[in-house]
Amino acid sequence: TIPPHVQKSVNNDMIVTDNNGAVKFPQLCKFCDVRFSTCDNQKSCMSNCSITSICEKPQEVCVAVWRKNDENITLETVCHDPKLPYHDFILEDAASPKCIMKEKKKPGETFFMCSCSSDECNDNIIFSEEYNTSNPDLLLVIFQ
């Protein structure tokens, strides 16, 4: 539920509540859709996306997708619901505060994706091995 003076609506996913019925604030994410990128062979990159958007649904998290093929490199920044696949992949790291890139198998290209749930966390995308989730300190942060 939401404050009593705000009317309730049935079956609407714009409203996300906790067990006490409090309303969840939405995520703020970089949201430039697909842009050409110069990010290559680096431990981490900034998105160079100037648009920070309010995610439409409070359950959405920030997502970044880095793709490289024979012709170009692109970086996609969006909001997305972690309950739904994105580019046919589950957002398994959606609870992470940082956007740690993981390689996914896609024919004909190199494809990395990350998701995260702190404000504008998809602005800084991390490829470095030292940040991968075998790091127990990071796991502590994610699952606290």
């Epitope: 939401i2 404050p3 309303v23 604030f25």
Partner: nanobody, 124 residues
Framework: EVQLLESGGGLVQPGGSLRLSCAAS???????RMWWVRQAPGKGLEWVS?????????YYANSVRGRFTISRDNSKNTLYLQMNSLRAEDTAVYYC?????????????????WGQGTLVTVSS
């Protein structure tokens, strides 16, 4: 505690403009990220725009970007929403809400976190 009171709603034709205000009583206005949130009849909440307390960095939903402008005057404890190029789909009750640092949820029924709302109707 901060109390929030919105004003400035009304009936406007498509393409028209309105400026909403949210007056906050209390001395802690400058500690909070402030939001404009709307609810169309029978629909859920839509988070429209937000502004930081310091530096006044602003954020918008994609549905209103380029048409709406959020601002705040910390000396007057007031939040504003300038709405231009209004469309029928902007018809809603508009609420202001406050968000403390690292706060992820707004408790239900907390009128110190929510205003009572002001109705905006866009119709010819």
């Amino acid at each position: 505690e901060v109390q929030l009171l919105e004003s400035g709603g009304g009936l406007v034709q498509p393409g028209g403009s309105l400026r909403l205000s949210c007056a906050a009583s209390g001395s802690t206005f400058t500690e909070y990220r402030m939001w404009w949130v709307r609810q169309a009849p029978g629909k859920g909440l839509e988070w429209v725009s937000a502004i930081e307390p310091i530096g006044h960095r602003t954020y918008y939903a994609n549905s209103v970007r380029g048409r709406f402008t959020i601002s705040r005057d910390n000396s007057k404890n007031t939040l504003y929403l300038q709405m231009n190029s209004l469309r029928a789909e902007d018809t809603a009750v508009y609420y202001c809400a406050k968000q403390a640092p690292n706060q992820r949820y707004v408790a239900r029924g907390r009128l110190d976190y929510w205003g009572q709302g002001t109705l905006v109707t866009v119709s010819s």
